[in-house]
């Protein structure tokens, strides 16, 4: 919509708004140690932080959601911080015939927005 | 991942988990009355509700986010309910030369998932 403009500056202060953050997790944390061999530890980029009015709005739906949340906060939730894109990750895992490589397209976030 | 299975039954009770809900909004609510002519009122389908562990997980990222939220709730947020697809909406709006129709592909949610 030409009449609602998403913004990129965080009104809540540094690091408070929707952004990418790296979380370290082991295969044990993920419950994957029985089938994934490597890497043993993953640097998982995830989307965290708040989505104040018009901040990094994903699309028109997110813009109107933000607006309606301001009018009906009990009825309409604020937009929330979710991945806008992903970076592929290759895992080495056990198979019936030995070891195999597989690429996961939707495991590690590359960018975030408010949806 | 073959080892984390998203689920479709809500453990919190009917209507509590992530689902599509219709919110009625006027052009005035949206701040669009100066440029949109019709419809005067919109039935906006939006995604609302909670995302308990493994419920309607959007993808592998959402599954591991749910898992890590269980382990590090202060560090990793729970997945949240966002549109998985949209349904197009045609709006009639003012232009410099008169009236025009425009289709918005990302205004009204059609399905929801936890991301």
């Amino acid at each position: 919509s030409a009449h609602l403009h998403p913004r990129d500056s965080c009104p809540l202060g540094p690091g408070r708004c929707c952004h990418l953050e790296t979380v370290q997790a082991t295969l044990e944390d993920l419950g994957w140690s029985d089938w994934v061999l490597s890497p043993r530890q993953l640097q998982l980029s995830m989307c965290v932080g708040e989505c104040p009015h018009l901040y990094r709005s994903a699309n028109t739906h997110a813009l109107i959601k933000a607006r309606l949340h301001g009018l009906q906060p009990d009825r309409v939730p604020a937009p929330c911080c979710v991945p806008s894109s992903y970076t592929p990750v290759v895992l080495m895992h056990r198979t019936d015939s030995g070891v195999s490589l597989q690429t996961y397209d939707d495991l590690v976030a590359q960018g975030c927005h408010c949806a | 991942s073959a080892h984390l299975h998203p689920r479709d039954s809500c453990p919190l009770g009917p209507g509590r988990c992530c689902h599509l809900e219709t919110v009625q909004a006027t052009l005035e609510d949206l701040g669009w009355s100066d440029w949109v002519l019709s419809p005067r009122q919109l039935q906006l389908s939006m995604c609302v509700g909670e995302c308990p562990h493994l419920y309607r997980s959007a993808n592998t990222h959402a599954l591991i986010k749910a898992r890590l939220h269980g382990l590090q709730p202060d560090r990793v947020p729970a997945p949240c309910c966002v549109p998985s697809s949209y349904t197009p909406v045609v709006l009639m709006h003012r232009t410099d030369s008169g009236v025009s129709l425009q289709t918005y592909d990302d205004l009204v949610a059609q399905g929801c998932h936890c991301a």
Epitope: M92, L101, T103 | -
Partner: antibody
Framework: EVQLVQSGAEVKKPGESLKISCKGS????????ISWVRQMPGKGLEWMGI????????IYSPSFQGQVTISADKSISTAYLQWSSLKASDTAMYYC????????????WGQGTLVTVSS | DIQMTQSPSSLSASVGDRVTITCRAS??????LNWYQQKPGKAPKLLIY???NLQSGVPSRFSGSGSGTDFTLTISSLQPEDFATYYC?????????FGQGTKVEIK
């Protein structure tokens, strides 16, 4: 500086054994996998296989399974490619490459080792 | 195994030309495709990863697109240093495979 340095060119006879090396420096060797790639004279690139130096897990392309052995010694940050019995058709340039499993690409390459097998 | 077919196998172009190289996978590989450039006597160099992401330090005249089975590498304005052989590479699942290469020569 992050780099992979490969051992020098080799001239061998058919039936002989050979082990070429690829030494990583400037980064934590066990944090990245190493792949080997073959390029026969005037030809394209062929993926041979991969090793996780931290656990020495290896995966081979079916074309190279049983023909070569990929190994690593993490104590000296070195990966190896070896043959027990060379053939004339093994004549090629062999490259090692560091694998970034985030993004899934070969980000650092060795300079290549030319292996010539001739009677 | 997934077969990667590049076209053309070679092309002649002039400095300033827009060059497009295509790569087709024998089955869907999502966006799990890289592009490498190789000059004679040198090791390959990564240009594009995940189908469309430009590797750090690579000039912006290089771009990649596509998903599924069909992919494209575009050089918007060919420079003298771009005359080389270009390879696509799939890493959707093992065994990983390269395309046969496209040689870009001076017209």
């Amino acid at each position: 500086e992050v780099q992979l340095v490969q051992s020098g060119a080799e001239v061998k006879k058919p039936g002989e054994s050979l082990k070429i090396s690829c030494k990583g420096s400037g980064y934590s060797f066990t944090d990245y996998w190493i792949s080997w790639v073959r390029q026969m004279p005037g030809k394209g690139l062929e993926w041979m296989g991969i090793i996780d130096p931290s656990g020495s897990y290896t995966i081979y392309s079916p074309s190279f399974q049983g023909q070569v052995t990929i190994s690593a010694d993490k104590s000296i940050s070195t990966a190896y490619l070896q043959w027990s019995s060379l053939k004339a058709s093994d004549t090629a340039m062999y490259y090692c490459a560091r694998v970034s499993y985030y993004g899934g690409y070969f980000d650092i390459w060795g300079q290549g080792t030319l292996v010539t097998v001739s009677s | 195994d997934i077969q990667m077919t590049q076209s053309p196998s070679s092309l002649s172009a002039s400095v300033g030309d827009r060059v497009t190289i295509t790569c087709r996978a024998s089955q869907s590989i999502s966006n799990n495709l890289n592009w490498y450039q190789q000059k004679p006597g040198k090791a390959p160099k990564l240009l594009i990863y995940a189908a469309s992401n430009l590797q750090s330090g690579v000039p912006s005249r290089f771009s990649g697109s596509g998903s599924g089975t069909d992919f494209t590498l575009t050089i918007s304005s060919l420079q003298p240093e771009d005359f080389a052989t270009y390879y696509c590479f799939q890493l959707d699942h093992s065994p990983f495979t390269f395309g046969q290469g496209t040689k870009v020569e001076i017209k």
